[in-house]
């Protein structure tokens, strides 16, 4: 299934192409995949198809969904999938995880950030940088048509860079940001802001009552050895040695593993004999180290069975 | 420019309480650990613990845990540093530092002094 | 948790001198250790990280050496402003521990 993840802010201009390819002279239809309805191509309209691209002028979070695009030709049909999802502006600083466009590493030699997606606005020169939430100053940050380069680069260096650009669409002018993480490599590996692979995010996990049940806490720090990367579990936000409760253990030690070669910990919180009050507490995965602290949530529900008559 | 600002000196009788503040600017204040260091006087320098203000998640070192409590307040970029019953041996210069996957910058100090 | 332990308490040596601060570790901390540059009424500031690289606007002539227990800082040349007080740091685990520190003096 040709189907691609894409995701932006509400009240920001987003641009989403077509994940099946043809000539630019080959015809593309865009729908919504829910109800089949056609998506206009007037650019009056604030949601619009223009050949490959699928504009959000501006986004909102009602626009979440599933999009299908068929690129019609004389001789085929190829249909893909967008699955466009629209969040609410973050009221501090934090990026979550799931706007982050994929980690670039760097080293002293070569220290591009590419602003990601930008290829897709008409966008003009120069864009601003931001790293953790500050604009960059300093003679050390140079911003190049659609990347930047630090000079000299340090370990400090590393973290959430934001560029943030403007899309001009007749006249009309649109803001668009866009996070990625960027490593910093020495010869020893590096370390980076802690990457929770599980739990996702206010995830929710179906449990019998009466069964026991387990849940992994797991957790990427970077490339070769790491330095105060751990990983623990907290029970509305306690931890858990202070929490009362013999049924609910951490597993002593955590397991150290290697995922396509970063270092990642794991460790496990066993419940046993599930009760009803376990599905009333709010389990916390926390990943932290010295760059920082990532905190995933996830909660336990009844799981539902299906009666077939 | 990334700077740490802490509170004055105080001079505090013992069994009273005290809460000393360390205040962050020019960086982003919820994204960086910030850390207590004591230094006692003519001594060395002892790790108290760390807060992480994003998430008001400490750690203290186990010298420590119990004996004073860490805090920050996001809203005004601000950590603290807090006692309920001084004793005289808690006489000592308190550094805060910020910790960007090291103790880059520091806070000027700010002596306790705890004397009847 | 890991002891530091610093060699020797108090060098004391002339400008232009080389300086050679030892730090030893109860246990291998790889090469998680800092070196800081305290002076007296000043805050401590970072000289060196990950046992060798060299902070933001520290001079050349500061260089760190070593991996898991045994580490050194050497001082290439002093100079006036050098004569202070030394400490290492352990960031391998928790808690984070410094050294006791080692006093450099003008002879």
């Known amino acids: 299934k040709f189907s691609k993840q894409s995701w932006g802010l509400e009240n920001e201009a987003l641009i989403v192409r077509c994940p099946r390819q043809g000539k630019s002279s080959y015809i593309v239809d865009w729908y919504y995949s829910q109800t089949n309805k056609s998506i206009p191509t007037q650019e009056r309209n604030r949601v619009f198809a223009s050949g490959q691209l699928l504009k959000f002028l501006p986004a909102e979070v009602a626009d979440s969904g599933i999009y299908t695009c068929i690129v019609r030709s004389p001789t085929f049909n190829r249909t893909g999938y967008a699955n466009v999802t629209i969040y609410k502006k973050q009221p501090d600083c934090n990026v979550p995880d799931y706007l982050m466009y994929s980690t670039v590493s760097g080293s002293e030699k070569n220290s591009k950030i590419y602003c990601p997606t930008i290829d897709l606005y008409n966008w003009t020169a120069p864009l601003e940088w931001f790293k953790n939430c500050q604009a960059l100053q300093g003679s050390r940050y140079k911003a190049h048509k659609s990347f930047l380069v630090i000079d000299n680069v340090m370990t400090d260096d590393a973290g959430d860079y934001t560029c943030k650009f403007i899309h001009n669409e007749n006249g009309a002018n649109y803001s668009v940001t866009a996070t990625r993480s960027f490593t910093v490599k020495d010869e020893q590996g590096f370390s980076l802001f802690p990457v929770i692979r599980a739990p996702a995010h206010n995830e929710t996990k179906e449990v019998e009552i009466g069964e026991n049940t387990n849940l992994t806490c797991s957790a990427c720090f970077g490339k070769g050895a790491q330095f105060l990367a751990t990983v623990q579990w907290q029970l509305n936000g306690n931890k858990i040695t202070d929490f009362s409760e013999p049924r609910i253990q951490q597993e002593e030690g955590q397991n150290q593993s290697f995922s396509n070669g970063l270092a990642c910990v794991n460790t496990v919180l066993r419940i046993a004999d599930v009760k009803e009050e376990d599905l009333l507490l709010r389990y916390d995965c926390l990943a932290l180290n010295l760059h920082g602290l990532r905190r995933h949530t996830i909660r336990l529900s009844r799981k539902h069975h299906h009666h077939h008559h | 420019e990334v700077q740490l600002v802490q509170s004055g000196a105080e001079v505090k009788k013992p069994g009273e309480s005290l809460k000393i503040s360390c205040k962050g600017s020019?960086?982003?204040?919820?994204?960086?650990?910030i850390g207590w260091v004591r230094q006692m006087p003519g001594k060395g320098l002892e790790w108290m613990g760390i807060?992480?203000?994003?998430?008001?998640?400490?750690r203290y070192s186990p010298s420590f845990q119990g004996q004073v409590t860490i805090s920050a307040d996001k809203s005004i970029s601000t950590a603290y540093l807090q006692w309920s019953s001084l004793k005289a041996s808690d006489t000592a210069m308190y550094y805060c530092?910020?910790?960007?996957?090291?103790?880059?910058?520091w806070g000027q100090g700010t002596l306790v002094t705890v004397s009847s | 948790e890991i002891v530091l332990t610093q060699s020797p308490a108090t060098l004391s040596l002339s400008p232009g001198e080389r300086a050679t601060l030892s730090c030893r570790a109860s246990?291998?901390?790889?090469?998680?250790l800092a070196w800081y540059q305290q002076k007296p009424g000043q805050a401590p500031r970072l000289l060196i990280y990950?046992?060798?690289n060299r902070a933001t606007g520290i001079p050349a002539r500061f260089s760190g050496s070593g991996s898991g227990t045994d580490f050194t800082l050497t001082i290439s040349s002093l100079e006036p402003e050098d004569f202070a007080v030394y400490y290492c740091?352990?960031?391998?685990?928790?808690?984070?521990?410094f050294g006791q520190g080692t006093k450099v003096e003008i002879k």
């Open positions: 530092a910020r910790i960007g996957g090291m103790f880059d910058y």
């Open positions: 020019g960086y982003s204040f919820t994204s960086y650990w």
């Open positions: 807060i992480y203000p994003g998430d008001s998640y400490t």
């Open positions: 246990q291998s901390v790889a090469n998680a």
């Open positions: 990950k046992a060798s």
């Open positions: 740091q352990q960031y391998y685990g928790w808690p984070i521990t």
